[in-house]
């Protein structure tokens, strides 16, 4: 059964229940509800899910039963709107319930919160977690789905099922181990880091679809899949792009049952036709469903076919370029993107899209000119600076990273970005700059041919985090401009920003720079975040401070923390030495 050739079903809920099975059905409904109502207690969601599941079973038994013919949006929306505390907990989101479908679902989607006011997840002791796992495995795993889904309202639902499967496997194995902590903690750390990365990648896909439209997403997918499957025909890539677009449109739209079902169909299709797609799929296709889909999504690029012809002949030198373009613009541009991408696994997807956009703009102009061929003859020359810009940027930043190490490289970016957009909240600047700084460890170790796709496409994901967080409470016109003008030019737009000369420095507040003994018990990461928060605040107070001035203050601050954490009376040390440090810093920075 292809992704699009479904039989008509009397009951959509029965259809999905049968396709997915009870376990996945319940998990996906829980994820959907937790992503919509992010503040609701776990128990309330479980109750709603159980009610929906019981109803689905009645429809499986008799598809003609009352309400079984209703759409999933109607059924789920009606269920969400039964929550008693909707108005008190969610305020204006309760107004969604007065609307009819499809407006009601759109309303719920618009109220998803990328930065919900929820407590940080604190990891209990290993023995406590193992006891909870053994006491009630089902509830323990549901709680995991719930906590991740409500904090990441755009998490790719079928992929979250894969994470939950790994989470369960980690506890099953490690709770029996001699040293439970040594076994479990690294696995949980890995899942946490991979989960954050997965969430951020999916958030970019949803932003691409929702803010820039299906055409933008399809262009991204053509470029990426052509790099990954360079031996596949254009029509094969086009089919995969169409199906993948449907899957992500569904997940980003809250249609999680359809999304998971269609993703399974797509994995099945890819594996059945792997000979026509890629030689790298064999291992993936031997795995169970969730692992298979994940594996396919992460599969390495296939080898490029030998002897690919030059692109210039048909896309520049031919006299038929405008004729071919006019016949079917999007197909012609799609073929250009496909042919360029399959030849350039060494380019980032966003660079490939910039080249395609430049090519399109040139044809639009030249095909209306007196001598089109003369006009577009040099179009490939326009690509050179577009290619060199990210190459040079990555070279410079990798050199800086190798010189400074990750923490100090993050600090350099913190200063750089705070000066560019000082109006952005300090927690957002710290989070985004820390993530930007991780590009060094992630990508600079790669050979030249893999650096750009690693670095620039990762930066697109991180800058999208800045864009979605900023959209919730816009404070900077420059951020809004870079985020909304062009999806593929976001990174060059931010890179081109200079110091914001219009910014009025923040008033000095000694409280911001007052530290206590609790900093000594923090993990190294948390301590870094405290110091980086102080660094952002320093730059906001003194945006014209030089690197040398900031380095001196930060070095003094590190020495102060180290000294007081070794003192017998830590709190007194922080109080007294802190005052001295603030005074010295003010003097050093001329505050």
């Amino acid at each position: 059964r292809g992704v699009f050739r479904r039989d008509a079903h009397k009951s959509e809920v029965a259809h999905r229940f049968k396709d997915l099975g009870e376990e996945n059905f319940k998990a996906l409904v829980l994820i959907a509800f937790a992503q919509y109502l992010q503040q609701c207690p776990f128990e309330d969601h479980v109750k709603l899910v159980n009610e929906v599941t019981e109803f689905a079973k009645t429809c499986v038994a008799d598809e003609s039963a009352e309400n079984c013919d209703k759409s999933l949006h109607t059924l789920f929306g009606d269920k969400l709107c039964t929550v008693a505390t909707l108005r008190e907990t969610y305020g204006e989101m309760a107004d969604c319930c007065a609307k009819q479908e499809p407006e009601r679902n759109e309303c719920f989607l618009q109220h998803k919160d990328d930065n919900p006011n929820l407590p940080r997840l604190v990891r209990p002791e290993v023995d406590v977690m193992c006891t909870a796992f053994h006491d009630n495995e089902e509830t323990f795993l549901k709680k995991y789905l719930y906590e991740i889904a409500r904090r990441h309202p755009y998490f790719y639902a079928p992929e979250l099922l894969f994470f939950a499967k790994r989470y369960k496997a980690a506890f099953t194995e490690c709770c029996q181990a001699a040293d439970k902590a040594a076994c479990l903690l690294p696995k949980l750390d890995e899942l946490r880091d991979e989960g954050k990365a997965s969430s951020a990648k999916q958030r970019l896909k949803c932003a691409s679809l929702q803010k820039f439209g299906e055409r933008a997403f399809k262009a991204w997918a053509v470029a990426r899949l052509s790099q990954r499957f360079p031996k596949a025909e254009f029509a094969e890539v086009s089919k995969l792009v169409t199906d993948l677009t449907k899957v992500h449109t569904e997940c980003c739209h809250g249609d999680l049952l359809e999304c998971a079902d269609d993703r399974a169909d797509l994995a099945k299709y890819i594996c059945e036709n792997q000979d026509s797609i890629s030689s790298k799929l064999k291992e993936c296709c031997e795995k169970p469903l969730l692992e298979k889909s994940h594996c396919i999504a992460e599969v390495e690029n296939d080898e490029m076919p030998a002897d690919l012809p030059s692109l210039a002949a048909d896309f520049v030198e031919s006299k038929d370029v405008c004729k071919n373009y006019a016949e079917a613009k999007d197909v012609f541009l799609g073929m250009f993107l496909y042919e360029y991408a399959r030849r350039h696994p060494d380019y980032s997807v966003v660079l490939l899209l910039r080249l395609a956009k430049t090519y399109e703009t040139t044809l639009e102009k030249c095909c209306a000119a007196a001598d089109p061929h003369e006009c577009y003859a040099k179009v490939f020359d326009e690509f050179k600076p577009l290619v060199e810009e990210p190459q040079n940027l990555i070279k410079q930043n990798c050199e800086l990273f190798e010189q400074l190490g990750e923490y100090k490289f993050q600090n350099a970016l913190l200063v750089r970005y705070t000066k560019k957009v000082p109006q952005v909240s300090t927690p957002t600047l710290v989070e985004v700059s820390r993530n930007l700084g991780k590009v060094g460890s992630k990508c600079c170790k790669h050979p030249e041919a893999k650096r750009m796709p690693c670095a620039e496409d990762y930066l697109s994901v991180v800058l999208n985090q800045l864009c979605v967080l900023h959209e919730k409470t816009p404070v900077s016109d420059r951020v809004t401009k870079c985020c909304t003008e062009s999806l593929v030019n976001r990174r060059p737009c931010f890179s081109a920003l200079e110091v914001d000369e219009t910014y009025v420095p923040k008033e000095f507040n000694a409280e911001t720079f007052t530290f206590h003994a609790d900093i000594c018990t923090l993990s190294e990461k948390e301590r870094q975040i405290k110091k980086q928060t102080a660094l952002v605040e320093l730059v906001k107070h003194k945006p014209k401070a030089t690197k040398e001035q900031l380095k001196a203050v930060m070095d003094d601050f590190a020495a102060f923390v180290e000294k007081c954490c070794k003192a017998d009376d830590k709190e007194t040390c922080f109080a007294e030495e802190g005052k001295k440090l603030v005074a010295a810093s003010q003097a050093a920075l001329g505050l």
Partner: nanobody, 125 residues
Framework: EVQLLESGGGLVQPGGSLRLSCAAS????????MGWFRQAPGKEREGVAS????????FYTNSVKGRFTISRDNSKNTLYLQMNSLRAEDTAVYYC??????????????????WGQGTLVTVSS
């Protein structure tokens, strides 16, 4: 709308060579993906090779890789198939086909919209 006419078939000994041609006329943009298919007696039609007339990319079925070469001459609206090291199992009626590059897949003849009448290739000693 689009007409395709094959030529060049015939009898050849194992190990020998043949060159098939296919002349296209009509709206040639509709033929910007072109391919060669073959059908042996009692067997299904199978894809042999395809080419995009824009971009020039080529695709081959595994059994002919390294032996057959597909090419095109856009100025003459002609498609070619150079067949070397021919084997008895290459005996079949060879068809020229064309369609849109957004649809045509070598493994699926139904994704090609236009077909020639076919030319017989017999490999026998």
């Amino acid at each position: 709308e689009v007409q395709l006419l094959e030529s060049g078939g015939g009898l050849v000994q194992p190990g020998g060579s043949l060159r098939l041609s296919c002349a296209a006329s009509g709206n040639t943009y509709l033929t910007s993906c072109m391919g060669w298919f073959r059908q042996a007696p009692g067997k299904e039609r199978e894809g042999v090779a395809s080419i995009y007339t824009v971009g020039g990319s080529t695709f081959y079925t595994n059994s002919v890789k390294g032996r057959f070469t597909i090419s095109r001459d856009n100025s003459k609206n002609t498609l070619y198939l150079q067949m070397n090291s021919l084997r008895a199992e290459d005996t079949a009626v060879y068809y020229c086909a064309a369609g849109s590059p957004a649809r045509c897949r070598l493994r699926d003849p139904t994704t090609f919209d236009y077909w020639g009448q076919g030319t017989l290739v017999t490999v026998s000693s």
